[in-house]
């Protein structure tokens, strides 16, 4: 903490200017209103603090606002914001885009991820759910951001926004985003044909359930394996050779390549060897012929 | 313009660990694996392993098993492949290539770091 | 593992004329699963045919590639210059990956 001071009369500060660039940190703390400071901020980041300056300025403001910033002071924060923790941003309540873009972009390039994405689920929270204009925004200055998002705020997401989601914005999405995601996508895309279905639920498929990935398999659509391998494991487990064949297509072959890979790996050691080598691609570690395959799970099940 | 850019050259002693990164930028991911080559000074082209970086998981060559372990981090599209136990015949310039997910070959390749084991 | 060979290991060639470089083999290697590279001095490999045959984007059509089971080959129909380097063969037909030995092709 900064030890507390008496500001010399001669500076006093009246207004945020670059004169403050010469303060020492003591006098900062000592010269520098907070109230000011607060509704001023517009000026501070086109004056070149250095990074201990800002820690003081940040530490003004905290005093001003224990229990969090007001949007108005949030927006201008401009290099301010690096400084923040996540813990400090929870506090925030933000429902204006501009101050998400404004904040996004001082980000850029900064290790920040955690920060953005406690800014992100401040804005769904503050705006009640993740609209259209906010999808946008963030795939406009943040691609892969949505996925910073928990499942819990992606199921606020109408299936009418979905639309607006390209592939690469949900690139660092895991399972269990996937999952909340793509019934939604299944629900905008449901009136496309085959081909165009195919193209625009891919990127989701990722959360998809068997009978979906086997109702795909009976449409021709030449799976390639980039997807295949982001299928759930439970979705592929119960997939026969003669649907992943179907639903591959000519890319079938790349299950040779990838065959040491999950899931194909763990696929390949539930299909019977008989089965595999119709494929005629060497596909080794299937269960050999006259072998018996008992399903405890099934007698689990009902004791 | 799809990029492989590699960490710089390494100078390691014996028994240390190397840790090389390979960022990559200009394409999807997770639709291509990573795969480490590696070319030791005057040899051929020897096949270390791989990652897919959708899943994180990874196959590596036998004779590197233990001693190899490759990791990715999908918010900056890095990936990186760290060599334990150094030994001479290690020196060498390590590759990252990217290989379509499904296929073998690899279509763009990184500058290569070079990494000097000497005691 | 699949050992490939490659031979020759080294040529010394006049510009336009034919270069063979032949890979072979250890075991047989499903010919989708077979690629070329070249690699000039200090820089890093470069892929020229993918699948046997299949020429990658850029390469020149004086390249060509060919053969199944064993025995694979590239042919350079009329070299130039620029094609002195190093050739490599690849499969990934079986684990692990592997490489040929390489081929050095320098102009005369």
């Known amino acids: 903490d900064v030890e507390r001071t008496t500001c010399p009369p001669e500076k006093e500060v009246h207004e945020i200017d670059e004169s403050l660039i010469f303060y020492k940190k003591r006098e900062l703390e000592a010269c520098v209103d907070a109230a000011l400071l607060a509704a001023q901020m517009d000026r501070v980041d086109a004056i070149p603090f250095t990074y201990e300056q800002l820690d003081v300025l940040k530490h003004k403001l905290d005093e001003l606002y224990p229990q969090g910033y007001p949007e108005s002071v949030i927006r201008h924060l401009g290099h301010l914001f690096l400084k923040m923790s996540p813990e400090d941003i929870r506090k925030w309540n933000v429902t204006s885009l501009e101050t998400l873009k404004a904040l996004l972009k001082v980000s850029k390039g900064h290790e920040m991820s955690a920060q953005v994405a406690t800014l992100i689920d401040r804005v769904v929270v503050g705006r009640g759910q993740l609209d259209k204009d906010t999808v946008d925004t963030l795939t406009a200055f943040c691609p892969g951001c949505l996925c910073s998002l928990s499942p819990e705020r992606l199921s606020s997401v109408p299936p009418s926004v979905i639309g607006a989601v390209r592939p690469q914005d949900l690139d660092t999405c895991g399972p269990r985003q996937l999952d909340v995601l793509y019934p939604k996508a299944r629900l905008a895309f449901q009136n496309m044909s085959g081909s165009e279905y195919f193209v625009k639920i891919r990127p989701f498929l990722g959360g998809a359930p068997t009978e979906d990935v086997k109702a795909l398999s009976q449409q021709n659509v030449s799976m390639d394996l980039a997807t295949f391998m982001k299928l759930r494991r439970e979705a592929v487990l119960p997939l026969t050779v003669a649907e992943v064949q179907k639903l591959l297509g000519p890319h079938v072959e790349g299950l040779k390549v990838e065959e040491q890979h999950s899931p194909v790996r763990d696929w390949i050691l539930k299909q019977r060897q008989d089965d595999l080598d119709t494929l005629g691609l060497g596909l080794q570690g299937g269960i050999p012929n006259g072998y018996l395959i008992l399903d405890l799970s099934v007698r689990e099940a009902l004791s | 313009e799809v990029q492989l850019v590699q960490s710089g050259a390494e100078v390691k002693k014996p028994g240390a660990s190397v840790k090389v990164s390979c960022k990559a930028s200009?394409?999807?991911?997770?639709?291509?694996?990573m795969d480490w080559v590696r070319q030791a000074p005057g040899q051929g082209l020897e096949w270390m392993g791989d990652?897919?970086?959708?899943?994180?998981?990874?196959i590596y060559n036998q004779k590197f098993n233990g001693r190899v372990t490759m990791t990715e981090d999908k918010s900056t599209s890095t990936v990186y492949m760290e060599l334990s136990s150094l030994r001479s015949e290690d020196t060498a310039v390590y590759y990252c290539?990217?290989?379509?997910?499904?296929?073998?070959?690899?279509?763009?390749w990184g500058q290569g770091t070079t990494v000097t084991v000497s005691s | 593992e699949i050992v490939l060979t490659q031979s020759p290991d080294f040529q010394s060639v006049t510009p336009k004329e034919k270069v063979t470089i032949t890979c072979s083999a250890s075991?047989?290697?499903?010919?989708?699963?077979l690629s070329w590279y070249q690699q000039k001095p200090d820089q890093s490999p470069k892929l020229l045919i993918y699948?046997?045959?299949n020429l990658a984007s850029g390469v020149p059509s004086r390249f060509s590639g060919s053969g199944s089971g064993t025995d694979f080959t590239l042919t350079i129909n009329s070299l130039e210059a620029e094609d002195a380097a190093t050739y490599y063969c690849?499969?990934?037909?079986?684990?692990?990956?592997?490489f040929g030995g390489g081929t050095k092709v320098e102009i005369k």
């Open positions: 075991s047989s290697v499903i010919s989708s699963y």
């Open positions: 690849h499969q990934w037909s079986s684990f692990p990956y592997t």
């Open positions: 990652i897919n970086p959708s899943t994180g998981g990874t």
């Open positions: 699948r046997t045959s």
């Open positions: 290539a990217r290989r379509r997910i499904g296929t073998g070959y690899f279509d763009v």
């Open positions: 200009g394409y999807t991911f997770t639709d291509y694996n």
